[in-house]
Interface confidence: low
C-alpha cells in the first residue's frame, strides 16, 4: 500500500510509470501501485528517493543526454536536486534540463533539454505535479540533536531506514537519525508520532487535563517550533488563564533558557494573538516587553525570569512548549443566527439572539457608558466570534473613524481581561501593537476602532461613543421580513441580495442553482462584503459554503464565475497552495476564511444578485 508521502511518477503520453529496475537502471513500466520499484518519495526539499532501494534519483553531471540513475542520498549534492518547473515539467535544479523518457529509443530515463510531452510527469492517479506531494521536515524530540529534522534515509548498524524506526530499542519508541550516517555521527531524536509510550513525552495538568510538552533541549525558530507541535496534533502553547501560567511556571522552574510559545504579532494588520486562535486576554510580559522594535514578532516564555514573556525575532533558535488536549476555554455555545428568533426594540439591530445599538454622538467615559447600557436592559457589548464582530462592522452602521467602548476590561484583575456582561472571553481581535497596556497610563478598558473594528486598550476616563448589547425578547415565530429590493428569503447588503443555498451541491451544481435563480455564486469585492458574508454563514453548523471563485478555467489563476476582477482575497493559512480547485468559505473557528476544495465535493453555497431598484455604480477603472 502507498503511504501518503509515496507516489508513482507517471507520464501521460506514454501511459507508463517510472520503474527503478536496479540502482543503475531507472526505466518505465506499466503502472502498478503494488510494485515497490515504482514507489518514490521526496526526502528533502529537492531529493526524490526510490522506496525500494532507499537511494536518490541523480545524474553524473548536469549535461544534456545523461542517464538518470540512483545514488546514495546526499543532501549536499547538486546532482540530486530536482524541481518542478512550470506545470508538470521535472528538471534538475537551476538548469533547463528535464526528466525525460522515450527519445532516441532509449530505455533509461534521461536528462534532456527537450520540454515536450515526454518530459512531463504527474503523480499517478492524479492531475498533480510531483511537487504537490512535497517533503515535510519532521522535527525530532529529545535525543541529542537539538530538535533537528530527521534525515531520511539514515544508516543505523549498516542498514538504511527511510522512516522512523524502533530498531535497537525494546520499548517501541520511534526514532530517526538526524544525519545520514547515524553509525558515525550518533545524532538522533524521537519522532513526533504516536507510538506506545509517546504519551510520556507530555505532562498532563490534572486539573484541566491539558497536556504540555517542554522541548527545552531543542533549538528551532518560532515557525519550526510551531510546525513541530502541529506534527503532533498540537499547537505552540497559549496561556489564557492565571492557573495555566502558574502550572507552567512550576513545570519550567528548573530551566533557564527561553522557550517559544504561540504568542505572536505576525498578522500584518492585527495585534498580539495566539497561534491556536485562543483569545489573548491574559498578559504576563516581562518588564520592558513587548518592545516595539520591528521584527520582534514572536514571544518566548522565560523560565529564569519567573516564566514571564518577552518578544524576540522569530528566527532566533530556542526550545519550545507544545500544548494539546481540551482547550482551557470554558465551553460556551453561541447560537447560530438561524436558530434564534430575534426581536429588537426600534433603533436596535438583531443578530443571533441579541440586539445591538451604537451610541456614537453621546460621548461617555467607560463607566458611564456601561451604566447607560445597563439602564437600557443590556451591557457594553461582548464579542465572541469573528461573525459577531463582522456583523457589528458590516450591519450596525460602524464607521472607519469610530472609536467605541466595548465591554472588555481588566479593571477587576490587572492584565486579565474580562467581559463586563460576565460571559467568557472566547475571542479577541487586537489592533497592531495592542494591547499596549502602557504603564504610565492605566489602560484598563477596551475600544473598537479603525476600518476593521479591531481593538485597543485605552484609559477608561476618555469620553467616547459605545456599543450596547442585550438579549432579544422572543415573541413566538419570527416574522420573515422581505428586505426592500430583495425577494423573500434573500438578505440585502448594500446593493446586493444574498441567499444561502441549502442543498449540498458540487461547485457546478451550486453555480447552476444560482443561475436558475437569476443570480450567481457570490463574488466578494472587499473587506466589508467579506465581513457581511462571515456574519451571514459563519455560525452555521455546515463546514463550507461555495463562493464563485475557482481556477477551473486556467490552472493556478483564480477567477470568479462572472466577469469580475479578483480585487480582494481572504485565504486561510496554507491556501491556495498548489492545489487546483474551487473556493469555499469556512465556518467555525476559521469563520469566513477561504479554502480550496475539490470542485466535486458537496457543500452549501451563497448566491448573489443586484438588488432591484439599485442604480449600478460605475465599475472602478484600473
Amino acid at each position: 500500500l502507498l503511504d501518503t508521502r509515496q507516489f508513482l511518477i507517471y507520464n501521460e503520453d506514454h501511459k507508463r510509470c517510472v520503474d527503478a529496475v536496479s540502482p543503475s537502471a531507472v526505466q518505465t513500466a506499466a503502472c502498478n501501485q503494488d510494485a515497490e520499484s515504482q514507489k518514490f518519495r521526496w526526502v528533502s526539499e529537492s531529493q526524490i528517493m526510490s522506496v525500494a532501494f532507499k537511494l536518490c534519483l541523480g545524474v553524473p553531471s548536469k549535461t544534456d543526454w545523461v542517464a538518470i540513475t540512483l545514488y546514495a542520498c546526499d543532501s549536499k549534492s547538486e546532482f540530486q536536486k530536482w524541481e518542478c518547473k512550470n506545470d508538470t515539467l521535472l528538471g534538475i535544479k537551476g538548469e533547463d534540463l528535464f526528466f525525460n523518457y522515450g527519445n532516441r529509443q532509449e530505455k533509461n530515463i534521461m536528462l534532456y533539454k527537450g520540454s515536450g510531452l515526454w518530459s512531463r510527469w504527474k503523480i499517478y492517479g492524479t492531475t498533480d505535479n510531483l511537487c504537490s506531494r512535497g517533503y515535510e521536515a519532521m522535527y525530532t524530540l529529545l535525543g541529542n540533536a537539538n530538535g533537528a529534522t530527521c534525515a531520511f534515509p539514515f544508516k543505523f548498524e549498516n542498514k538504511w531506514y527511510a522512516d522512523c524506526t524502533s530498531a535497537g530499542r525494546s520499548d517501541g519508541w520511534l526514532w530517526c537519525g538526524t544525519t545520514t550516517d547515524y553509525d558515525t555521527d550518533k545524532l538522533f531524536g524521537y519522532c513526533p508520532l504516536k507510538f506506545e509510550g509517546s504519551e510520556s513525552l507530555w505532562n498532563k495538568d490534572p486539573l484541566t487535563s491539558v497536556s504540555y510538552q517542554i522541548n527545552s533541549k531543542s533549538a528551532l525558530t518560532w515557525h519550526q517550533a510551531r510546525k513541530s507541535c502541529q506534527q503532533q496534533n498540537a499547537e505552540l502553547l497559549s496561556i489564557t488563564e492565571i492557573h495555566e501560567q502558574t502550572y507552567l511556571t512550576g513545570l519550567t522552574s528548573s530551566l533557564t533558557s527561553g522557550l517559544w510559545i504561540g504568542l505572536n504579532s505576525l498578522s500584518f494588520n492585527s495585534g498580539w494573538q495566539w497561534s491556536d486562535r485562543s483569545p489573548f486576554r491574559y498578559l504576563n510580559w516581562l518588564p520592558g516587553s513587548p518592545s516595539a522594535e520591528p521584527g520582534k514578532s514572536c514571544v518566548s516564555l522565560n523560565p529564569g525570569k519567573n516564566a514571564k514573556w518577552e518578544n524576540l525575532e522569530c528566527v532566533q533558535k530556542l526550545g519550545y512548549i507544545c500544548k494539546k488536549g481540551n482547550t482551557t476555554l470554558n465551553s460556551f455555545v453561541i447560537p447560530s443566527e438561524s436558530d434564534v428568533p430575534t426581536h429588537c426594540p426600534s433603533q436596535w439591530w438583531p443578530y443571533a439572539g441579541h440586539c445591538y445599538k451604537i451610541h456614537r454622538d453621546e460621548k461617555k467615559i467607560q463607566r458611564d457608558a456601561l451604566t447607560t447600557c445597563r439602564k437600557e436592559g443590556g451591557d457594553l457589548t461582548s464579542i465572541h466570534t469573528i461573525e459577531e464582530l463582522d456583523f457589528i462592522i458590516s450591519q450596525l452602521g460602524y464607521e472607519p473613524n469610530d472609536e467605541l467602548w466595548i465591554g472588555l476590561n481588566d479593571i477587576k484583575i490587572q492584565m486579565y481581561f474580562e467581559w463586563s456582561d460576565g460571559t467568557p472571553v472566547t475571542f479577541t481581535k487586537w489592533l497592531r501593537g495592542e494591547p499596549s497596556h502602557e504603564n504610565n497610563r492605566q489602560e484598563d478598558c477596551v475600544v473598537m476602532k479603525g476600518k476593521d473594528g479591531y481593538w485597543a486598550d485605552r484609559g477608561c476616563e476618555w469620553p467616547l461613543g459605545y456599543i450596547c448589547k442585550m438579549k432579544s425578547r422572543s415573541q413566538g415565530p419570527e416574522i420573515v421580513e422581505v428586505e426592500k429590493g430583495c425577494r423573500k428569503g434573500w438578505k440585502k447588503h448594500h446593493f446586493y441580495c444574498y441567499m444561502i443555498g441549502h442543498t449540498l451541491s458540487t461547485f457546478a451544481e451550486a453555480n447552476q442553482t444560482c443561475n436558475n435563480e437569476n443570480a450567481y455564486l457570490t463574488t466578494i469585492e472587499d473587506r466589508y462584503e467579506q465581513a457581511f458574508l462571515t456574519s451571514f454563514v459563519g455560525l452555521r453548523p455546515e463546514k463550507y459554503f461555495w463562493t464563485g471563485l475557482s481556477d477551473i478555467q486556467t490552472k493556478g489563476t483564480f477567477q470568479w464565475t462572472i466577469e469580475e476582477e479578483v480585487r480582494f482575497t481572504h485565504w486561510n493559512s496554507d491556501m491556495p497552495g498548489r492545489k487546483p480547485g474551487c473556493v469555499a468559505m469556512r465556518t467555525g473557528i476559521a469563520g469566513g476564511l477561504w479554502d480550496v476544495l475539490k470542485c466535486d465535493e458537496k457543500a452549501k453555497f451563497v448566491c448573489k444578485h443586484w438588488a432591484e431598484g439599485v442604480t449600478h455604480p460605475p465599475k472602478p477603472t484600473t
Partner: nanobody, 119 residues
Framework: DVQLVESGGGSVQPGGSLRLSCAAS????????KAWFRQAPGKEREEVAA???????NYADSVKGRFTISRDNAKNTVYLQMNSLKPEDTAVYYC?????????????WGQGTLVTVSS
C-alpha cells in the same frame, strides 16, 4: 551502566496492599522516564504505570485508582503503591527506566519481583 533493583514483592490476600521499590545505581535517575511493567504467567508483558521526567503519571485502565507511582529523586528510587489488590494482579513486576537524551537504545530493566494475590 545503570542497574535497577526491585524489592517489596510477596504474597498478599485479595484487598491487601503492597509497596514495590525500584532503586537505581545512577545519580542521574531523575532525568529518566520510569515505568512499572508486569508479566503474568503465559501472558505478554504490559505497562502498569509510568512517571515522566517531568513528573506526569500514566496508568493502565485496569489499575487506575488502585495503584500509585511516585519517585524520590534524592534516593534514586521509584515506587509503586498497590492497594485493593486482586488475584488478577498476580505477576512478576519489572521496573524500567528509559534515558531520553543519549543513544536510541538505552533503556534499562530490573530483574523483577513476584507479587502473588490469593486467599
Amino acid at each position: 551502566d545503570v542497574q535497577l533493583v526491585e524489592s517489596g514483592g510477596g504474597s498478599v490476600q485479595p484487598g491487601g496492599s503492597l509497596r514495590l521499590s525500584c532503586a537505581a545505581s545512577a545519580r542521574i535517575f531523575s532525568s529518566y522516564h520510569k515505568a512499572w511493567f508486569r508479566q503474568a504467567p503465559g501472558k505478554e508483558r504490559e505497562e502498569v504505570a509510568a512517571i515522566t521526567s517531568g513528573g506526569s503519571t500514566n496508568y493502565a485502565d485496569s489499575v487506575k485508582g488502585r495503584f500509585t507511582i511516585s519517585r524520590d529523586n534524592a534516593k534514586n528510587t521509584v515506587y509503586l503503591q498497590m492497594n485493593s489488590l486482586k488475584p488478577e494482579d498476580t505477576a512478576v513486576y519489572y521496573c524500567k527506566a528509559v534515558v531520553v537524551t543519549t543513544t536510541p537504545y538505552s533503556d534499562y530493566w530490573g530483574q523483577g519481583t513476584l507479587v502473588t494475590v490469593s486467599s
